[in-house]
Amino acid sequence: NECPELQPPVHGKIEPSQAKYFFKDQVLVSCDTGYKVLKDNVEMDTFQIECLKDGTWSNKIPTCKIVDCRAPGELEHGLITFSTRNNLTTYKSEIKYSCQEPYYKMLNNNTGIYTCSAQGVWMNKVLGRSLPTCLPECGQPSRSLPSLVKRIIGGRNAEPGLFPWQALIVVEDTSRVPNDKWFGSGALLSASWILTAAHVLRSQRRDTTVIPVSKEHVTVYLGLHDVRDKSGAVNSSAARVVLHPDFNIQNYNHDIALVQLQEPVPLGPHVMPVCLPRLEPEGPAPHMLGLVAGWGISNPNVTVDEIISSGTRTLSDVLQYVKLPVVPHAECKTSYESRSGNYSVTENMFCAGYYEGGKDTCLGDSGGAFVIFDDLSQRWVVQGLVSWGGPEECGSKQVYGVYTKVSNYVDWVWEQMGLPQSVVEPQVER
C-alpha cells in the first residue's frame, strides 16, 4: 500500500517530506513566498493530498504560480510607470505613480513607489494599499508674472496663463422681476471651488436682506482670456453657493463667498488654483505690491449677452491687470471717515491703491483676487478680494480700493470645502 515518490512543484514544497508514503498518509503542498498553489485553475494557499488504499495519490501535485497584482488602479490626475521590464505586474514588480506635473503634486511628497506583495496587492511603504493623492498645485502660473519692482498704475493686457486662477462669474437671476443679470470675478482654489465676494452672489434685492442667488443662476468661466472668444474657456455651473453667514450689506463686512462647481475642472496651463494664505489677522503688510486682474467693467448695467458676445464696450475684451500697493490701515480708515456716508473700514478689510489716484480696481471686477507673491513658498497667494470703493469715480485721488482680508477667513474656507487643513498643506502658503 505504498504510494509513489512525490516531487515538489517548482517554487514549492511538500510537507512532511518522507522517503516513503503509505495508506492514509497526507501531504500538504505549499508554495514559496510570492507564489500561489494552482489547482484546476483555482488559486489557493495550500493543497492537501492523501495516499489511498490502492497505492495511488488522491490528486495530482498542483503547480506553483507566481502572484500577479494585475493592472494597478488608475490615479486621478496621475500617471503610472512600470519599473520592471515588459510592464510586469507579478510578485516583487515595481510601479511608480506620479502626478500630472506641473498642475498636480503628490500629497505629503510620497515617493509613489508600489511593490507587488506576496498577497497580490500593490503596496506602498507609507500608504499601504491606499493610492496616493494628487493635489492641484497652487499659485504657480505657467507663465511668469512680471517683476513687481516697476510701479505700474494703469492697467495692462494680461497674457494668457498669467492669471490661471481668474474666473468670470455670470449671474442671471431669473427669479427677479425683471430678470437681473450681472457679473463678477472669482479665484479658483481647487478643481471644484471658486472664492469670490459675497456681494457678487447676493440676490440684487429691493431691500437689504442677504439672500444668495440660486445656484441654477450661476455660471463660472475659467481659462477665459478674451471675452470675444469663449471657445478655449471651461464653463461650469454651480453645485453650491455659500455666502459668509455674517456678510453685512450695510458695510460689506465679511464680504466673502464660495462657489462649488458642478464638476471638477481639468487643470492646465490656463486653469490653475491660487494659494490660500496662512491664518493671519494682520493681513498683507503695508506697501506690499499686489496684482488684481479683471475684465474692467465700466457699466454696471451690463447684460450677460453683452459680456459674453463680441463687440461689447462695457468691459475690456482682454483680461487686464493692475499693480497696487497695500495702504496702511490707519491711512485708509482716515481717508474714508472724512467722507460723508457710512464708510467703515473694518478689521476684515484692507485697502490698496495710490494717494495720487490713477487706475484702481475698476480694472478688476468685484470678487477678483488681489494676489501677492510669497517669497518663501515662491507662490502667488490670494490676500484680498475686490469688495468696494468710495463714492467718487474709481481711481480718484485718495480713494483707495477696499478688499476683503482673506487671511481672516482661511479656517472658514477650509471648513466649507470640507477639507482639514493638514490634508491640504501644499495649498497653504509656507
Partner: antibody
C-alpha cells in the same frame, strides 16, 4: 402666472388663535421670501414679518414678535401665519406678498368679536 | 426703528394736473456700498391689495405707466404723477427696506 391665494375670512373670539394661509403658484416657492402685512379698517399698512422658505429664516417687526408666528410648508408651496391671543386690535385685513412685493394675495379679513 | 413720515395726508387734484407727494425717513436710506436708496412707493386702490410702483427710490416697476416718477436720496423722497388720471384715485404709501421694513402713513389722492 404668479398667484398668491389666501384663505377665507375668519370670525374668532377674543383670546383665541387663528391660522391664515397663503398658497403660492407660478414661481419657485423657495427662491423668495413671503412677507405679511396688516391693515386695520381705514388705516395704513403695517409690516408684520417675513419668512424665507429655503431655510425657514424669519424676521419680525418687534411689535408682532409675540403676536404672529410664520411658517411654511414647501411641499405644498404654502406660507402660514398663526395669530395668538387675539383682541379687537387684531381685527384687520392681512396680506401676504412675494417676489419682493411684486405679487400680493387678495387679503384675509380677520374679525375678532365675542 | 426707522420712522417714515408722508405728507400731505390727503390731496385733491383735477385730472391732467401734476401732483407731488413727499416721504421723509428718520435716517438715511442710502446704502453707501450698493449706492442704492432702499425706498419703495405703493399704490392701493379702494378694496384692492397694494401695488408696487417704484423701488430703489426711482426705478419704475415693470408695467407701471411712465407718468409715475420717484426721486430723492438719503432722507427726502417724492413721488410725482405728471398728469393725474381718474384711475389714479388711491392711497399712496412709501416704505423703507433699508433696515427691515416700515411703511409711511399714506397720502390719499382724490380726484376733483
Amino acid at each position: 402666472q404668479v398667484q398668491l391665494k389666501q384663505s377665507g375670512p375668519e370670525l374668532v373670539k377674543p383670546g383665541a388663535s387663528v391660522k391664515l394661509s397663503c398658497k403660492a403658484s407660478g414661481y419657485t416657492f423657495t427662491t423668495d421670501d413671503i412677507n405679511w402685512v396688516k391693515q386695520r379698517p381705514g388705516q395704513g399698512l403695517e409690516w408684520i414679518g417675513w419668512i424665507y422658505p429655503r431655510d425657514d429664516r424669519t424676521k419680525y417687526n418687534d411689535k408682532f414678535k409675540d403676536k404672529a408666528t410664520l411658517t411654511v410648508d414647501t411641499s405644498s408651496n404654502t406660507a402660514y401665519m398663526d395669530l395668538h391671543s387675539l383682541t379687537s386690535e387684531d381685527s384687520a385685513v392681512y396680506f401676504c406678498s412675494s417676489l419682493e412685493d411684486t405679487y400680493w394675495g387678495q387679503g384675509t379679513l380677520v374679525a375678532v368679536s365675542s | 426703528d426707522i420712522v417714515m413720515t408722508q405728507s400731505p395726508s390727503s390731496l385733491a387734484v383735477s385730472a391732467g394736473e401734476k401732483v407731488t407727494m413727499t416721504c421723509k425717513s428718520s435716517q438715511s436710506l442710502l446704502n453707501s456700498r450698493t449706492r442704492k436708496n432702499y425706498l419703495a412707493w405703493y399704490q392701493q386702490k379702494p378694496g384692492q391689495s397694494p401695488k408696487l410702483l417704484i423701488y430703489w427710490a426711482s426705478t419704475r416697476e415693470s408695467g407701471v405707466p411712465d407718468r409715475f416718477t420717484g426721486s430723492g436720496s438719503g432722507t427726502d423722497f417724492s413721488l410725482t404723477i405728471s398728469s393725474v388720471q381718474a384711475e389714479d384715485l388711491a392711497v399712496y404709501y412709501c416704505k423703507q427696506s433699508y433696515n427691515l421694513y416700515t411703511f409711511g402713513g399714506g397720502t390719499k389722492l382724490e380726484i376733483k
